[in-house]
């Protein structure tokens, strides 16, 4: 014989001894209907707020406060948002590894360092894990067969490269 | 700077079906939900319903069978329909952030013939 | 639905008076949230999670309760308190607000 509790819809409760569907109480869920019990519905407060009011049919859906971020499934825990030189990882917040940086406060993550050379330019300032790099201007490099000549320009005192 | 502002007819007609528009500014509609509340003149406030960052929506059960809550992203606009309506919805019609710390600053709406 | 009950419906106070608002619950909610609305404006959010004042509200107004009943104090009344205040619960939809209390200036 099919359990009358079979055809509850989402909201409501059953026990089996007294196969009535009966609505949630406020404060609980149920979004499968047929259960025995109806859930708790989440709180928000505190470092969390709601995304999502609790229904009879859905629980809250709660995220984290400004200058908080969510860790953990169905945002368990609120951890403060990272620094610059940090990213978010699932473990949290972590410091940039060596060669790489992070600008932003509380989003982005590490990226590498500009790699000055392959733009033929040299390191004007090292990078931290706050900051990139900064390149210098351009190195001028020779060939064997280039000759260079300084010539007066502009009467004393001034001179011109000219690469010849 | 977040902002609600409320639009729509300011008298329809018993049986006829009442649209309003939320358009808002300084939030995205796909991070946060907006309420629709209504006052009635000289009475309390009475929420309405909400829609969700996620298109999602809850209504108050009272006037579920008569209500839509629908947005458009694209254009930052929530919208309100009731159908079927009475004397007694007209009031003043409000949205608001899902945290009800931003308000607009509502419509006034007369059901009258 | 949770039915909030809120009281006294009306009450008139002279500046520097102490003046508390009462909310109870039809069932046990977790937070009350509380708003001031003046004639003619739109209502502004006042106390969130029971207790806490939101961004430019004065401390002589203060927020408590747990379960089923809350209330709002107002410590030293002033005339720009003078408005109507309603309690609201989030703890599951349908939200519900109370009827409103009219806070006058005697």
């Known amino acids: 014989v099919q359990n009358s509790c079979d055809n509850c819809q989402p909201g409501t409760f059953c026990r089996k001894y007294n196969p009535v569907c009966k609505s949630c109480p406020p404060s609980t869920f149920s979004s499968i209907g047929g259960q025995p019990n109806c859930n708790i519905c989440r709180v928000c407060a505190g470092y969390f707020r709601f995304k999502k009011f609790c229904s009879s049919t859905h629980n809250a859906e709660c995220e984290c406060i400004e200058g908080f971020h969510c860790l953990g499934p169905q945002c368990t825990r609120c951890e403060k948002d990272c620094r610059p030189g940090q990213e978010l990882t699932k473990q949290g917040c972590k410091t940039c590894s060596l060669g790489t940086f992070n600008d932003q406060n509380g989003t982005g993550v590490c990226r590498p360092w500009t790699n000055c050379s392959l733009d033929g330019r040299s390191v004007l300032k090292t990078g931290t894990t706050e900051k990139d790099v900064v390149c210098g201007p351009p190195v001028v490099s020779f060939s064997p067969s280039t000759t260079i000549s300084v010539t007066p320009e502009g009467g004393p005192g001034g001179h011109s490269l000219q690469v010849l | 700077q977040v902002q609600l502002k409320e639009a729509g007819p300011g008298l329809v007609q018993p049986t006829q079906t009442l649209s309003l528009t939320c358009t808002v500014s300084?939030?995205?509609?796909?991070?946060?939900?907006v309420h629709w509340i209504r006052q009635p003149p000289g009475k309390g406030l009475e929420w309405m319903g909400i829609?969700?960052?996620?298109?999602?929506?809850d209504y108050n059960s009272a006037i579920k069978s008569r209500l839509s809550i629908s947005r458009d992203t694209s254009k930052s606009q929530v919208f309100l329909k009731i159908n079927s309506l009475q004397t007694d919805d007209t009031a003043m019609y409000y949205c608001?952030?899902?945290?009800?710390?931003?308000w607009g600053q509502g419509v006034m709406v007369t059901v009258s013939s | 639905d949770i039915v909030l009950t809120q009281s006294p419906t009306t009450i008139a106070a002279s500046p520097g008076e102490k003046v508390t608002i009462t909310c109870r619950a039809s069932?046990?909610?977790?937070?009350m949230y509380w708003y001031q609305q003046k004639s003619g404006a739109s209502p502004k959010l006042w106390i969130y999670?029971?207790?806490k004042l939101a961004s430019g509200v004065p401390n002589r107004f203060s927020g408590s309760g747990s379960g089923t009943s809350y209330s709002l104090a107002l410590n030293t009344m002033e005339t720009e308190d003078a408005a109507t205040y309603y309690c609201?619960?989030?703890?599951?939809?349908?939200?519900?607000f109370g009827s409103g209390t009219k806070l006058e200036i005697k």
């Open positions: 609201q619960q989030w703890s599951s939809t349908p939200l519900t």
């Open positions: 069932s046990s909610v977790s937070y």
């Open positions: 999670d029971t207790s």
């Open positions: 300084g939030f995205s509609l796909t991070s946060d939900g």
């Open positions: 829609i969700y960052y996620d298109g999602g929506t």
């Open positions: 608001a952030r899902i945290h009800f710390d931003y």
